[in-house]
Interface confidence: low
């Protein structure tokens, strides 16, 4: 039932899926609205059909529609009477069409929907004037999307009369200016998304009832909330991926729980100025609104001091230029549970009473320039709630002796890429001078530890005694195990993931024996010097094994390969100098499709390098000659 152009006519109803009161006709090349669906249909989805025009009476057969979706229907025109009988319609999706073409007619059509709650007009090349006309008189709307249009300026006429609106999505437009009062009529507005626009600053933010504000991916250099004592209900503020120079000036009274500041140009600058005359370091903003001019003065290094951060739970300050945290900064956030300072310029961190706050569960200080952590003397319970601590990629040589002793709940610790050494015996907590080693012993809660690329010397005795490690990464510490797994014996029965990549491990005299690692699921031995296959005990839990980039010349004996293939899901074997005459008995692994990189496994045959997949079954003919030679 296709017409000559290949589009289905409205008579072909077999193309729609009907479930209860919902009709799903998406992507069926329909040129018009089907007319013979059940009249009680409450939900009609016509996405991705080339309708072009929604005619008067198209929807007349369905007087009970509550939800209509016309996403990506090439709509250029909606006739004035298209929604005339649709008194029950609550949700209308018109995203990704061409409604700017006949916007006045479309606006007239929409005005017949006084009960509409949700309207999606995204991706229609609408300007602010077009949008204003379309939204006129739709006072029942709760949720509006104008994302992906060509809106540039907002004033109080655009959203006039939408006093019940709760959710407004304006992301991916070209908004560079928002006039004062543009949102004043939206007393119910709770979610506002302005991401991916061109806003240069927000210097008089006063939407006290807003709950979520997303202004990420703009060109903001300033964010200032209105001064004064108004109570703000803001819970989530996303200012990430902007060009902020200073910590945002937040409300004096707020319920802010999540503050996202990732990827800006922020720092604290007090140290750059003469602290005896701090009053000189201020900025003044001239706010011109009609014929009223206000001047706002802001102190640029105490920008956080008047902000209400008491409810803050999640703070992301990663990818900025913070060189230090001012005294009292973290003390203002007693409820903080997640703090991300990844990729800044921090050189030292002072740990004091309530700084970081006791509620902190995740702290990421990775990719900074930390050379020292300072622990205030006599602190009994600092970091007591901390579960995840990332110190990766800094310049630490050690940590203060009491630091981990007090952090009784840490489960995940990443100290990779710091030039640390492990303390030979339990470190004395009264040691003088900067910390020169790290002791993980008796960190009972510790389950995951990464020490990759730490330049560790040979491991001392029982370095992980008293921990609960299930994940351990010792990769890129050359010679640290000295061919023996003995330093891991305390944690061997618990370990599930063990990474021993690039460690110079060799097995010239004796195969590495993992018999005591009964729970090991994932073992990475890549980039070592192993010449023989590692040995595993009887009850093998291993699921993934990586042996790439070693010196293996023979594949494992048939017995071993069959044992491995029973539990093993994935094994990596490429980039080893196998002898093609030693591949016999690999059938079990090969047929079980366990070898993830089987297509890249090569072997040497008569000084040629051959892909194993190209070898015929059994032992190659050339090997029989080689074996005969050996027997002579």
């Amino acid at each position: 039932w296709r017409n000559r152009s290949g589009t289905a006519t409205a008579a072909s109803q077999g193309v729609c899926k009907l479930v209860g009161g919902a009709a799903d006709c998406r992507g069926q090349s329909l040129a018009s609205v089907p007319s013979s669906l059940p009249p009680h249909a409450r939900m009609l989805t016509l996405d991705a059909n080339p309708l072009k025009t929604l005619w008067n009476h198209s929807l007349q057969p369905y007087p009970l529609l509550e939800s209509l979706s016309l996403h990506s229907c090439h709509l250029e025109r909606i006739s004035r009477g298209a929604f005339q009988e649709q008194g029950h319609l609550r949700s209308l999706v018109l995203g990704d069409n061409c409604l700017s073409e006949n916007y006045e007619e479309t606006a007239a059509a929409l005005h017949a929907l006084p009960g509409l709650r949700r309207l999606d007009l995204s991706g229609n090349a609408l300007t602010e004037d077009m949008a204003a006309l379309m939204l006129q008189n739709l006072s029942s709307l709760r949720s509006v999307s104008l994302a992906g249009n060509t809106i540039m300026r907002l004033d109080d006429s655009v959203f006039e009369g939408l006093e019940r609106l709760r959710e407004l999505d304006l992301q991916r437009n070209y908004i560079f200016e928002i006039e004062g009062g543009a949102f004043d009529g939206l007393a119910e507005l709770r979610h506002l998304n302005l991401a991916f626009n061109n806003l240069p600053c927000i210097v008089d933010f006063g939407l006290t009832r807003l709950r979520v504000l997303n202004v990420s991916y703009n060109v903001l250099e300033w964010f200032l909330a209105t001064g004064g004592e108004a109570a703000f209900e803001l819970e989530t503020l996303d200012l990430s991926h902007n060009q902020l120079l200073f910590f945002p000036l937040l409300p004096q009274y707020s319920k802010l729980r999540t503050l996202l500041l990732r990827d800006n140009n922020m720092g604290f600058y007090r140290d750059l100025y003469n602290t005896s005359s701090p009053r000189e370091m201020v900025a003044q903003f001239l706010l011109v609104d009609g014929n009223v001019t206000n001047i706002t003065t802001v102190s640029l290094w105490e920008e956080f001091s008047s902000s209400d951060l008491a409810d803050l739970r999640f703070l992301d300050m990663s990818q900025n230029q913070f060189q230090y945290l001012p005294d009292g900064f973290l003390r203002k956030m007693p409820s903080l549970s997640h703090l991300n300072l990844h990729q800044n310029c921090l050189m030292t961190l002072h740990i004091r009473e309530h700084e970081p706050p006791g509620a902190l569960t995740e702290l990421d200080l990775s990719h900074n320039q930390l050379s020292e952590l300072h622990l205030a003397p006599g602190l009994a319970s600092c970091l007591g709630s901390l579960r995840l601590f990332n110190l990766s990629s800094n310049q630490l040589l050690g940590v203060p002796p009491g630091l981990f002793a007090n952090a009784r709940n840490i489960t995940t610790l990443d100290m990779s890429h710091n030039q640390i050494s492990l303390c030979p015996l339990p470190a004395a907590s009264d040691r003088v001078g900067p910390p020169s080693c790290v002791d993980f012993r008796n960190m009972a809660s510790l389950r995951s530890l990464s020490l990759e690329g730490c330049g560790l010397g040979a491991l001392p005795d029982c370095p992980f005694q008293g921990t609960s490690l299930t994940y351990l990464d010792l990769s890129s510490n050359w010679g640290v195990l000295n061919g023996s797994l003995a330093p891991l014996q305390d944690v061997a029965p618990m370990l599930q993931v063990l990474s021993l990549r690039n460690m110079g491990l060799h097995s010239s005299f004796m195969a590495l024996d993992f018999s005591g690692f009964g729970n090991l699921r994932d073992l990475d031995l890549s980039g070592n010097c192993l010449t023989t296959f590692p040995r595993f005990g009887g009850s093998l839990a291993l699921e993934t094994l990586d042996l790439r980039r070693n010196s293996l010349t023979a594949l494992p004996q048939k017995a071993v390969s069959e044992q491995l293939s029973r539990g093993l899901r994935t094994i990596y074997l490429s980039q080893n100098p196998y002898d093609c005459c030693g591949v016999d008995g690999w059938g079990a692994l090969q047929h079980g499709q366990t070898v993830a990189d089987w297509a890249m496994v090569t072997c040497n045959l008569s000084s040629k390098i051959i892909r194993v997949t190209e070898l015929p079954g059994g032992v190659p003919r050339d090997c029989k000659w080689e074996r005969l030679d050996l027997g002579l």
Epitope: E167, A187, R211, A230, A231, F232, K255
Partner: antibody
Framework: EVQLQQSGPELVKPGASVKISCKAS????????MNWVKQSHGKSLEWIGR????????FYNQKFKGKATLTVDKSSSTAHMELLSLTSEDSAVYYC???????????WGQGTTLTVSS | DIVMTQAAFSNPVTLGTSASISCRSS???????????LYWYLQKPGQSPQLLIY???NLASGVPDRFSSSGSGTDFTLRISRVEAEDVGVYYC?????????FGSGTKLEIK
């Protein structure tokens, strides 16, 4: 401490009007809506409407349009509700309640009892 | 308007045991961004109502954690894990998804 102090009980004649007040303290008066609720004897709660003290905007339950008028006096942090053309049906306890963002009616006044009787 | 429906009385409960109170809305109170605009209030004899639960499952400040609430978009349950004498009163559910805000008729908690 947040407090909403309502005016005392009222006894009025049918056809008259009455103005009930609700004085707020302990928080920023203009930062929250003020709601009004009716509770007839032994009955449930009915939302009358609310006012935004910041700009005086009002929202009424259709049922109470023409019956109730909501106003505020910012200088004294006081909300008022005037009830017009009273009948015995209007006899009830009237509560004011603060409207927070997360929730409405996080704090209530102690209630004002209105009796309409000849 | 959204209609909130409650039973007038709960099953009588013994002190120290748990109690459940139900509420149904005529329309889903669950919004696309995951918040359910359902509230529970308790009115003790001779007192103003007090907020117990906001947005279906969040405990208001000062409310003991014996109280909890769960539900779908339209059917909700308030649970009291260990009923105490001071829990006696009328429990109202309410919605503030749409104006006008509407309350249930209230459920009286009865002690055996």
């Amino acid at each position: 401490e947040v407090q909403l102090q309502q005016s005392g009980p009222e006894l009025v004649k049918p056809g008259a009007s009455v103005k009930i007040s609700c004085k707020a303290s302990g928080y920023s008066f203009t930062g929250y809506f003020m709601n009004w609720v009716k509770q007839s004897h032994g009955k449930s709660l009915e939302w009358i409407g609310r006012i935004n003290p910041y700009n005086g905007d009002t929202f009424y339950n259709q049922k109470f349009k023409g019956k109730a008028t909501l106003t505020v006096d910012k200088s004294s942090s006081t909300a008022h509700m005037e009830l017009l053309s009273l009948t015995s049906e209007d006899s009830a306890v009237y509560y004011c309640g603060r409207g927070g963002y997360d929730y409405d009616f996080d704090y209530w006044g102690q209630g004002t009892t209105l009796t309409v009787s000849s | 308007d959204i209609v909130m429906t409650q039973a007038a009385f709960s099953n009588p409960v013994t002190l120290g045991t748990s109690a459940s109170i139900s509420c149904r809305s005529s329309k889903s109170l669950l919004q696309s961004y995951g918040i359910t605009y359902l509230y529970w209030y308790l009115q003790k004899p001779g007192q103003s109502p007090q907020l117990l639960i906001y947005q279906m499952s969040n405990l208001a400040s000062g409310v003991p954690d014996r109280f909890s609430s769960s539900g779908s978009g339209t059917d909700f349950t308030l649970r009291i894990s260990r009923v105490e004498a001071e829990d006696v009163g009328v429990y109202y559910c309410a919605q503030n998804l749409e104006l006008p805000f509407t309350f249930g008729s209230g459920t009286k908690l009865e002690i055996k």
